[in-house]
């Protein structure tokens, strides 16, 4: 019955079983509802808007990493509908802390104004 179906399942009245909601492809996100036993008849997948990406499945589109604005890094690969942006080396005037574990966002560049003496990215 409906209540037994999981987060991404709908109740198929023909088979009397819970069935997996159709997953979206890379670069798309679900539109309208499917899950916990019900499925909208017009349920489908829409493309990710500009500056967002999705790997597909039931994932909503997420914003690309802001390499320059947030990480103060160069853009190695710009993101598209299917892939996140990849950040490269720090922007001029910024450096990366050595031996610092990556945080949840990856590596963050810091201003040379805060750099220890002789930091290679900040010399000259």
């Amino acid at each position: 019955e409906y209540s037994n179906c999981g987060e991404n399942e709908y109740y198929n009245q023909t088979t009397g079983l819970c069935q997996e909601c159709p997953p979206c492809g890379p670069g798309e996100e679900p539109y309208l509802s499917c899950g916990y036993g019900t499925k909208d008849e017009d349920y489908g997948c829409v493309p990710c808007p500009a500056e967002k990406f999705s790997k597909g499945g039931y994932q909503i589109c997420r914003r690309h990493k802001d390499c320059e604005g947030f990480f103060r890094a160069t853009v190695l690969t710009p993101g598209d509908m299917e892939n996140d942006a990849e950040c490269g080396p720090c922007l001029p005037g910024y450096y990366m802390l050595e031996n610092r574990p990556r945080n949840i966002y990856g590596m963050v560049c810091y201003s040379c104004l805060l750099a220890p003496p002789n930091t290679k990215e900040c010399v000259g």
């Epitope: 159709p22 539109y31 008849e41």
Partner: antibody, heavy 119, light 107 residues
């Protein structure tokens, strides 16, 4: 085999009625939402109406609301458009078009049937 | 309703040319933009869906791009069989709307 074939077009007097049909073949009709789209002579395409696979969702363009009725018979793999109170501006080629599963565009179109509203 | 504008109603190009047809939406349609080809005999065919994805069986010379409100269809190596009218269509919200069409002819 043509997947979508419209019929029922012809000459109708203003204020008259007409019922168009669209016969589907070569695919599981009951899995697909279906649309009617029209094109007036020397004009662009205009979306007219949509019906979901199981008929639970039906939508119309404002220009036809209250005068046209979209319906379907999944057992006979046929889509219909009942047109009433016809006006000269309804003169057009009427196409039925299939909505791709899970997507929001028309992936297969019929060849169209012409409706002419004139006295 | 979302208005779709194809600023060029007709254009003429030579065989082998690269042709770009543009389409503008009255508001952001989040890449939910599709392109159709209507041949002179009236037959309509889907070419590109969701801005840049090619429908199966469509020649690789057809490509799409854009984002937000501005989109384009490019034919990279014009062939005789490409003589047709091209329509953009937004599938973001009902009522679905189409551009006025761009009629492509060979010089």
């Amino acid at each position: 085999e043509v997947p979508l074939e419209e019929s029922g077009g012809g000459l109708v007097k203003p204020g008259g009625s007409r019922k168009l049909s669209c016969a589907a073949s070569g695919f599981t009709f009951s899995d697909y939402g279906m649309h009617w789209v029209r094109q007036a002579p020397e004009k662009g395409l205009e979306w007219v109406a949509y019906i979901s696979s199981g008929s639970s969702a039906i939508y119309y363009a404002d220009t036809v609301k209250g005068r046209f009725t979209i319906s379907r018979d999944n057992a006979k793999s046929t889509l219909f458009l009942q047109m009433t109170s016809l006006r000269s501006e309804d003169t057009a080629m009427y196409y039925c078009a299939r909505r791709e599963i899970l997507r929001y565009y028309f992936d297969v179109w019929g060849a169209g049937t012409t409706v002419t509203v004139s006295s | 309703d979302i208005q779709m504008t194809q600023s060029t109603s007709s254009l003429s190009a030579s065989l082998g040319d690269r042709v770009t047809i543009s389409c503008r939406a009255s508001q952001d349609i989040s890449n939910n933009l599709n392109w159709y080809q209507q041949r002179p005999d009236g037959t309509v065919k889907l070419l590109i869906y969701y801005t840049s994805r090619s429908q199966s069986g469509v020649p690789s010379r057809f490509s799409g791009s854009g984002s937000g409100t501005d989109y384009s269809l490019t034919i990279s190596n014009l062939e005789q069989e490409d003589v047709a009218t091209y329509f953009c269509h937004q599938g973001k919200t009902l009522p679905y709307t189409f551009g006025g069409g761009t009629k492509l002819e060979i010089k």
